[in-house]
């Protein structure tokens, strides 16, 4: 799986999306978790509605909510409050039984907020020059990783 | 009416290549699971893996993985099940069937004839 | 890998008997069990999925009891059509596993 990255500003809210085919996971409930170290587990921060058919029901823990379209094929998880701790690896998941399926990597990137002046030179700006896969509502950009990026950063 | 038609029964030699097929029709066959099963003679059910021909998504249970490959071509509703080397003990009725998902579970529920393969210097 | 065990290994039951066929799990399942019949020189036939539901065209008198690492089918009133080999199958884990079977003869 490629890596998605995902950048919001923090003090905001940042939406994720993971698409993915419906008739594939059918009957299936999703989960969002957040990848612990390189190749820890992935601990689960929320997932949706027991009742599948009530997956389409925002589901929130804490500040993560997630919600799912089952006929369209997208989850949605919000991360509301955005904050620099929420930076890092997740994993979008399709569930059946004991198993969990990937459908998308996620890395979440937190901006400092443009009018907290105290950070104004660590800010970072996309120019237009550059691509994206997606632009999403709620102020959040993503891409995928490139080839020889990784998510975490060599541990000596 | 949803069915999958297996080829017919092979009579082959040791070291030989073979590709055996299930052919569905009557749903969309991009949106179904496909599994693959052995059965050796006098002997019970056996899962080898299971592919998704929407996106040739393929699952191997580990005793078949590097064994046998599955494949499927979405463009004629096949799904293909291969060897690259037989093996006397690779004699068995090996079935094909639909994984049907659904908010109760999911159901292998409906299956090939059966493909009948002897392998036999 | 989970380990299904089935018991008995072979049940002879007389026509109209009730007939009760175990199934157990290494290790919890959940519901995600099905049971299946096969007659010699058939495929088999989906008779249970989701631990309890019964596929379409199976008769009232197949029933499933159980969940977890434990669990029963049974056979109410024993038809002609009844006598065959039923495995079951569990897709909680991968990979997927069948039990051994349990076969029905007459007695």
């Known amino acids: 799986h490629n890596t998605t990255v995902f950048q919001g500003v923090a003090g905001q809210s940042l939406q994720v999306s993971c698409p993915y085919d419906s008739m594939k996971h059918w009957g299936r409930r999703k989960a969002w978790c957040r990848q612990l170290g390189e190749k820890g587990p992935c601990q689960r921060v929320v997932s949706t509605h027991n009742l599948w058919l009530l997956s389409f029901l925002r589901r929130w823990n804490g500040s993560t909510a997630i919600t799912d379209d089952t006929l369209g094929g997208t989850l949605t998880i919000t991360l509301r409050n955005l904050q620099p701790h929420d930076a890092g690896l997740y994993q979008c998941q399709s569930l059946h039984g004991s198993e969990a399926d990937t459908l998308r990597k996620v890395l979440v990137e937190v901006l400092a907020d443009p009018l907290d002046h105290r950070d104004a030179g660590d800010l970072w700006f996309p120019g237009e020059s550059e691509s994206f896969e997606d632009a999403h509502v709620e102020h959040s950009i993503s891409r995928s990783l490139l080839e020889g990026e990784i998510p975490f950063p060599p541990t000596s | 009416e949803v069915q999958l038609v297996q080829s017919g029964a092979e009579v082959k030699k040791p070291g030989e290549s073979l590709m055996i097929s299930c052919k569905g029709s009557g749903y969309s066959f991009t949106s179904y699971w496909i599994g693959w099963v052995r059965q050796m003679p006098g002997k019970g059910l056996e899962w080898m893996g299971i592919i998704y021909p929407g996106d040739s998504d393929t699952r191997y249970s580990p005793s078949f993985q590097g064994q046998v490959t599955i494949s499927a071509d979405k463009s004629i509703s096949t799904a293909y099940l291969q060897w690259s080397s037989l093996k006397a003990s690779d004699t068995a009725m090996y079935f094909c069937?639909?994984?049907?998902?659904?908010?109760?579970?999911?159901?292998?529920?409906?299956w090939g004839q059966g493909t009948l393969v002897t392998v036999s210097s | 890998e989970i380990v299904m065990t089935q018991s008995p290994a072979t049940l002879s039951v007389s026509p109209g008997e009730r007939a009760t066929l175990s199934c157990r799990a290494s290790?919890?399942?959940?519901?995600?069990l099905a049971w299946f019949q096969q007659k010699p020189g058939q495929a088999p036939r989906l008779l249970i999925y989701?631990?309890?539901t019964r596929a379409t065209g199976i008769p009232a008198r197949f029933s499933v009891s159980g969940s977890g690492t434990e669990f029963t089918l049974t056979i109410s009133s024993l038809q002609s059509e009844d006598f065959a080999v039923y495995y079951c199958?569990?897709?909680?884990?991968?990979?997927?596993?069948f039990g051994p079977g349990t076969k029905v003869d007459i007695k």
């Open positions: 199958l569990q897709d909680n884990n991968w990979p997927p596993t």
């Open positions: 989701g631990a309890s």
């Open positions: 069937a639909r994984r049907r998902q659904g908010i109760w579970g999911d159901a292998l529920d409906f």
């Open positions: 290790q919890s399942v959940s519901s995600n």
